[in-house]
């Protein structure tokens, strides 16, 4: 079948980096500048992707492969093949249509991207808050009150003061 197909269709012999030129008796012609064909037997070459504005060229276009873009500093890629660039924010913020906004009280974001997430509710696990949360950090949960001996607290009390030179009794 393949041999029959190649006899019937001379375009199937055109390798990647070329196209089957109908205007020249189906001769294999090289892709013009700023275009490529990544597979053989193509009747046209595809236009190379241009990385402009926020997009930076990660890999130049060649006759057989498209250009690849990434994002300029301060932005990060979204979508397949970095089809979009999204603005970074500071830790403790999230990106909205009004720009970067601080996380509301009770929420945090420890990254430059993504949304503010609620602090962990320690009491749901029967634990207490050991370290309070901030806009940039989640709370740290400590041991549950039941784990502590009666009368003890999660904060170690200071050692009793004693006069210098006296050994403990």
């Amino acid at each position: 079948f393949e041999r029959t197909r190649s006899l019937q269709d001379p375009c199937s012999n055109c390798p990647a980096g070329t196209f089957c030129d109908n205007n020249r008796n189906q001769i294999c012609s090289p892709c013009p500048p700023n275009s490529f064909s990544s597979a053989g037997g193509q009747r046209t070459c595809d236009i190379c992707r241009q990385c402009k504005g926020v997009f930076r060229t990660r890999k130049e276009c060649s006759s057989t492969s498209n250009a690849e873009c990434d994002c300029t500093p301060g932005f990060h890629c979204l979508g397949a093949g970095c089809s979009m660039c999204e603005q970074d924010c500071k830790q403790g913020q999230e990106l909205t249509k009004k720009g970067c906004k601080d996380c509301c009280f009770g929420t945090f974001n420890d990254q430059k991207r993504g949304i503010c997430r609620p602090w962990t509710n320690c009491s749901l696990d029967g634990k207490s808050v050991l370290v309070n949360g901030t806009k940039e950090r989640d709370v740290v949960c400590g041991p549950s009150p039941a784990d502590l001996s009666p009368g003890a607290s999660s904060v170690t009390p200071p050692a009793p003061a004693r006069e210098p030179g006296h050994s403990p009794q």
């Epitope: 504005g53 926020v54 979204l78 979508g79 089809s83 979009m84 660039c85 999204e86 603005q87 249509k97």
Partner: nanobody, 123 residues
Framework: EVQLVESGGGLVQPGGSLRLSCGAS????????MLWFRQAPGKGLEWVAN????????YYVDSVKGRFTISRDNAKNSLYLQMNTLRAEDTAIYYC????????????????WGQGTTVTVSS
Amino acid sequence: EVQLVESGGGLVQPGGSLRLSCGASGFTFSSYWMLWFRQAPGKGLEWVANINQDGSEKYYVDSVKGRFTISRDNAKNSLYLQMNTLRAEDTAIYYCARGGDGYSDSHFGTDVWGQGTTVTVSS
């Protein structure tokens, strides 16, 4: 081919005005959020303003609020940035960009950018 082309930049004195334009082609302009960004010499890209599909929502970075106005004319496939009371710190290359599919619903990414137009504010 999907394309954005900015124009209207130039040299202007402090306190002066300029109107930037961005012509869109190759896509259904009225279906997309549009944005302006700028890049001052030696600085990173900064978001300036954005506008939703029908022009009913507009947002600005704090430093340009009350001085800049973003607008669009969907019949002309054009985006505009009216810049008044210009300051030296507004000197930058200004870019228009298209919000990607799903902008403001699931992300705030941009997928198509123009080549930029230069605004210089100097006496």
